[in-house]
């Protein structure tokens, strides 16, 4: 499966939208910084087949979509930007789902790398628990927005590597 060019563009658009969503200076939130333990090793991409790698990406985007679809998120971010961001993520999920279906047919391997997906889930659980602890404060959301931007940037490198592998 050729991870479509549109998916790569979608990732870039999602990053731009995330950047535009910032409302307060990150410098005013330095005291709230937190290490969420991004599972970098799951995005090094050498150890598994393509369908598995795509399913890990899918999990990351799905959990991001879930995170920004909550009531607390709607109360924080500018509505039109949030809607565009959600639409972008939804499109990426569709792209990846189509890709996985194709790849599984080619590889005839199990669809998911369960342990890698669990690592992504635990990472997002840390983020949601952090937000809860901080009572969804503007600074907490700013820290999370910056973290998701960072994780998207890292996964973008992973996607580029996947594209080159084809």
């Amino acid at each position: 499966c050729d991870l479509p060019q549109t998916h790569s563009l979608g990732n870039r658009r999602a990053l731009i939208l995330l950047a535009q969503m910032g409302r307060i200076s990150p410098f005013s939130c330095l005291k709230d910084r937190h290490d969420f333990g991004f599972p970098q090793e799951e995005f090094d991409g050498n150890q598994f087949q393509k369908a598995q790698a795509i399913s890990v990406l899918h999990e990351m985007i799905q959990q991001t979509f879930n995170l920004f679809s909550t009531k607390d998120s709607s109360a924080t971010w500018e509505q039109s930007l949030l809607e565009k961001f959600s639409t972008e993520l939804n499109q990426q999920l569709n792209d990846l789902e189509a890709c996985v279906i194709q790849e599984v047919g080619v590889e005839e391997t199990p669809l998911m790398n369960v342990d890698s997906i669990l690592a992504v889930k635990k990472y997002f659980q840390r983020i949601t628990l952090y937000l809860t602890e901080k009572k969804y404060s503007p600074c907490a959301w700013e820290v999370v927005r910056a973290e998701i931007m960072r994780s998207f940037s890292l996964s973008k490198i992973f996607q580029e590597r996947l594209r080159r592998k084809e």
């Epitope: 342990d115 889930k121 809860t132």
Partner: antibody, heavy 122, light 107 residues
Framework: EVQLVQAGAEVKAPGESLRISCKVS????????ISWVRQIPGKGLEWMVK????????IYNPSFQGHVSISVDKSITTVYLQWSSLQASDTAIYYC???????????????WGQGTLVAVSS | DIQMTQSPSSLSASVGDSVTITCRAS??????FHWYRQKPGKAPELLIY???NLQTGVPSRFTGSGSGTECTLTITSLQPDDFATYYC?????????FGQGTKLDVR
Amino acid sequence: EVQLVQAGAEVKAPGESLRISCKVSGYTFTSYWISWVRQIPGKGLEWMVKIDPRDSYTIYNPSFQGHVSISVDKSITTVYLQWSSLQASDTAIYYCVRHYLTQSLVDYFDHWGQGTLVAVSS
Amino acid sequence: DIQMTQSPSSLSASVGDSVTITCRASQSVSNYFHWYRQKPGKAPELLIYSASNLQTGVPSRFTGSGSGTECTLTITSLQPDDFATYYCQQTHGYPFTFGQGTKLDVR
């Protein structure tokens, strides 16, 4: 088969140190959180602390923070709970438990160790 | 901390009966309610997770319902094995907390 096997009972004097263990097998150790739960004899259950064995990220119940510490040894898939100075009030059964994490990020305790009885008495 | 209050604290019943145990949280915990059974001298075991989902291997006579601040555990057609202590738990907020337990004994 998922198994959490805990060390045997311990009898200690107040002020002594102690480390109890929980040996895990039957699944990928780094994929699931592990917690410790305390049960004072004849009483209810209290969650103490949890750790992500992947990178030793920990979250403590404030009631236990500073009095106990949790650690892991990935090479032997074992989780530890440690006291530097035991008190009589630490007398209890301690269970290690595995967390399962759903797609919607709800976690619950799906496997329990058999428990370690710690008796602290002078 | 989120307080979990179970009622009743103790309950007497006979084999074949149906019983219901209620758990109330001091604030909403969505569906992050779970139920455990502890037999004397044994470790607790998971029965129901996320308020209403039956754990694999648990008989269908156990059912859970509710969300928000209240959930219930119903056991139909009680078996000898079911006379034990039952605990509810929330994992919505830290620290995770359990109810004080409901002891189910033979009438």
